[in-house]
């Protein structure tokens, strides 16, 4: 409550998160031209990536291009790479959408399809849709513990969202457990009216807002966080404007003294923790 006589000060905050959960992933792979279903277990180290600032990331889906090495190969067929003769390719050309440097040759990709040859990590990553349903659809059952320390230096007051004696086996609930700092990912999405399984396919950005409205006067002391959630990415984004949230990373290895890599296009949810509020004191 805004008391006119109070001196207000904005919150200074630090955040630390811990994600927990295990996912069973059923991946379809092609081995010697035969499709196989591979079961694997993903733990925290497999699906989280270190992020800067007050954010954490959870992988929910992925596409793999295995056994890439640096050599010459035909581009993946697209409108920009298909060609009918060498004239449709240009030596040294680097298209922003391309994965390599053109050699100037138009070569057979497959059957009667011809594409421009490139010097790149080959084979070139295919242009394909993210798997449906998401491979880590079960990530909605993962939980995140949010540790939030706050400070009002002008009022010489420090506190945190986790107080001694808190039941650490709790799960946040808007009405039944509003002070619990452990959040089930699926519940966060339910709160914003979004379907976790839908967002998990292409990825997205979710805001976790922590609002501190602190009255630091001795007789009316109140300083507890209020949690709310907000979808931050544009869910109406047109396909051509890259909906969702994804990035690529590679795992490098050597095979017969040749450097190779597995390229992984990762789709997932970035959670941004937004801490704001004020502390007022007479």
């Amino acid at each position: 409550s805004d008391k006119l006589y109070q001196r207000k000060e904005p919150v200074i905050s630090s955040v630390h998160t811990k994600v927990k959960g295990i996912a069973e992933v059923k991946e379809e792979i092609v081995e010697n031209g035969v499709k196989k279903l591979v079961h694997s277990v993903f733990d925290t180290a497999d699906y989280t990536f270190p992020l800067q600032g007050n954010s954490f990331f959870v992988m929910t889906n992925f596409l793999k291009t295995e056994g890439q090495e640096q050599r010459l190969c035909p581009e993946y067929p697209t409108r920009r790479t298909l060609c009918s003769s060498d004239r449709g390719c240009k030596k040294g050309w680097m298209d922003p959408q391309s994965k390599g440097i053109q050699t100037g040759r138009c070569v057979v990709y497959e059957g009667n399809q011809k594409t421009c040859e490139v010097s790149a990590w080959c084979p070139i990553e295919a242009v394909e849709e993210a798997p449906r349903p998401a491979l880590l659809n079960s990530a909605e059952n993962f939980t995140v513990l949010i540790k939030n320390n706050i400070d009002f230096p002008g009022h010489n007051y420090t506190t945190r969202n986790i107080l001694p004696g808190l039941n650490i086996t709790c799960t946040f609930h808007k009405t039944q457990n509003p002070q619990c700092p452990i959040f089930r990912l699926g519940d966060i999405f339910r709160e914003t009216g979004d379907n976790f399984s839908d967002v998990a396919i292409q990825g997205g950005i979710m805001g976790i807002e922590i609002y501190w409205d602190c009255n630091l006067d001795r007789w009316f002391h109140h300083c507890r966080p209020k949690y709310s959630f907000r979808r931050l990415d544009d869910k109406t984004t047109n396909v051509s404007l890259y909906p969702g949230y994804n990035f690529r990373y590679a795992k490098y290895y050597k095979e017969n003294n040749v450097e190779k890599r597995t390229l992984i296009k990762v789709f997932g949810i970035r959670f941004d923790i937004l801490v704001f509020g004020t502390g007022g004191k007479f």
Partner: nanobody
Framework: EMQLVESGGGLVQAGGSLRLSCAAS????????MGWFRQAPGKEREFVAA???????DYGDSVKGRFTISRDDAKNTVPLQMNSLKPEDTAVYYC???????????????????????WGQGTQVTVSS
């Protein structure tokens, strides 16, 4: 979806001239590179001429110096002026459009049929000797 309608085809004597026109509708015309292709019976579709959204042009080797492509962004049309016509110019002429909204089509790609998303139904040109 972009609709393309060709007109101006017909029968002409060798050495004569014809002016084809392509009328576009349904999309922001000025964001598209426009091309003319032709296909003679039993042959592959062949590049004739193209003009990018910013006015850069390219011509097929067999029509250089005889054909001229232009564009009228106010009328959403792409005329193709064909002079000194030869019997080997006989074919169905198609108009095509390539989206340049997210970036220009490189000049060396303007002749590639794969760059073009939208195609007209074609207009017949017959050159008699």
């Amino acid at each position: 979806e972009m609709q393309l309608v060709e007109s101006g085809g017909g029968l002409v004597q060798a050495g004569g001239s014809l002016r084809l026109s392509c009328a576009a509708s349904g999309r922001t015309f000025r964001h598209y590179a426009m091309g003319w292709f032709r296909q003679a019976p039993g042959k592959e579709r062949e590049f004739v001429a193209a003009i990018s959204s910013y006015g850069s042009t390219d011509y097929g080797d067999s029509v250089k110096g005889r054909f001229t492509i232009s564009r009228d962004d106010a009328k959403n049309t792409v005329p193709l002026q064909m002079n000194s016509l030869k019997p080997e110019d006989t074919a169905v002429y198609y108009c095509a459009a390539a989206d340049e909204t997210l970036g220009a089509v490189p000049n060396f790609r303007l002749h590639e049929k794969y760059e073009y998303e939208y195609w007209g139904q074609g207009t017949q040109v017959t050159v008699s000797s």
